[in-house]
Amino acid sequence: AGYVFRDKVMSEFNNNFRQQMENYPKNNHTASILDRMQADFKCCGAANYTDWEKIPSMSKNRVPDSCCINVTVGCGINFNEKAIHKEGCVEKIGGWLRKNV
């Protein structure tokens, strides 16, 4: 039962994270939550940073600044892969959830 619950939590978190990405950066509250998660967990996007390319409000050469290894204003514009966290947040935060939930 514990594994089923854990998988459900992971699935819900994945769906929710992707849903929140769709609202970035239009919704300030959503943006600050996602930015906080990406910065704290050193991750970018749901599965990986390329998820941000699919967000209509984001230019294809852009990720949120919170994806950057060294976060500065505008660091996510015209980003270099070497300068951002490439691991996705669902897996990264999921690992933390598995340990702590």
């Epitope: 230019s59 294809k60 050469n61 852009r62 505008g74 514009i77 015209n78 270099n80 892969e81 300068a83």
Partner: antibody, heavy 119, light 108 residues
Framework: QVQLVESGGGLVKPRGSLRLSCAAS????????MNWIRQAPGKGLEWVSY????????YYADSVKGRFTISRDNAYNSLYLQMNSLRAEDTAVYYC????????????WGQGTTVTVSS | DIQMTQSPSSLSASVGDRVTITCRAS??????LNWYQQKPGKAPKLLIY???SLQSGVPSRFSGSGSGTDFTLTISSLQPEDFATYYC??????????FGQGTRLEIK
């Protein structure tokens, strides 16, 4: 020294194919995005395609989409452009260009290789 | 797509003149604007990046300014080797990477 050397250009018939290569030296190749930029005779600069450090992300100008394919081999410090279904309007000098990204500008350009599409 | 428009398209000037070339973006590009110089039969060369930063090895007579949509490249005192074609380019929103149509600087 930092260098990009293109090869593979030449004369090809319409609807033909050609593969351009670019050999990079003097820098850590996978630290950079790479571009192909072309210049038709007497015309300005036109971006053709770019590829990310790892090769995961590739984009193309609308004028070449579906006909050209960019790729890279980081183990061999090489960039490629496979050009299929060539048209007369693809006639140009093709430059291999290094791109550090962010706001730094495209800082290293090859000498260019000439592609002529004519029957 | 962001369009880049340069003016003038050609310009005649003399050695020692102060020359200004302008570049306008169709929407704000912050300071993500680069300038290149190209001589006949040669590859372009990066002169200015981030609107106003001089690329290493480029003479200090070249300078860039502007932010948002309007940018200028200034050559304070033209030298014989400066007669060439100049291009602006934006990297704020790509793809596509877009260039201005070029400004040809000729000897008067």
């Amino acid at each position: 020294q930092v260098q990009l050397v293109e090869s593979g250009g030449g004369l090809v018939k319409p609807r033909g194919s050609l593969r351009l290569s670019c050999a990079a030296s003097g820098f850590i190749f996978d630290d950079y995005f790479m571009n192909w930029i072309r210049q038709a005779p007497g015309k300005g600069l036109e971006w053709v395609s770019y590829i990310s450090n790892s090769g995961n992300t590739k984009y193309y100008a609308d004028s070449v989409k579906g006909r050209f394919t960019i790729s890279r081999d980081n183990a061999y410090n090489s960039l490629y452009l496979q050009m299929n279904s060539l048209r007369a309007e693809d006639t140009a000098v093709y430059y291999c260009v290094r791109d550090p990204r962010s706001y730094y500008g495209m800082d290293v350009w090859g000498q260019g290789t000439t592609v002529t599409v004519s029957s | 797509d962001i369009q880049m428009t340069q003016s003038p398209s050609s310009l005649s000037a003399s050695v020692g003149d102060r020359v200004t070339i302008t570049c306008r973006a169709s929407q704000s590009i912050s300071s993500y604007l680069n300038w290149y110089q190209q001589k006949p039969g040669k590859a372009p060369k990066l002169l200015i990046y981030a609107a106003s930063s001089l690329q290493s090895g480029v003479p200090s007579r070249f300078s860039g300014s502007g932010s948002g949509t309007d940018f200028t490249l200034t050559i304070s005192s033209l030298q014989p080797e400066d007669f060439a074609t100049y291009y602006c380019q934006q990297s704020y929103s790509t793809p596509p990477i877009t260039f201005g149509q070029g400004t040809r600087l000729e000897i008067k």
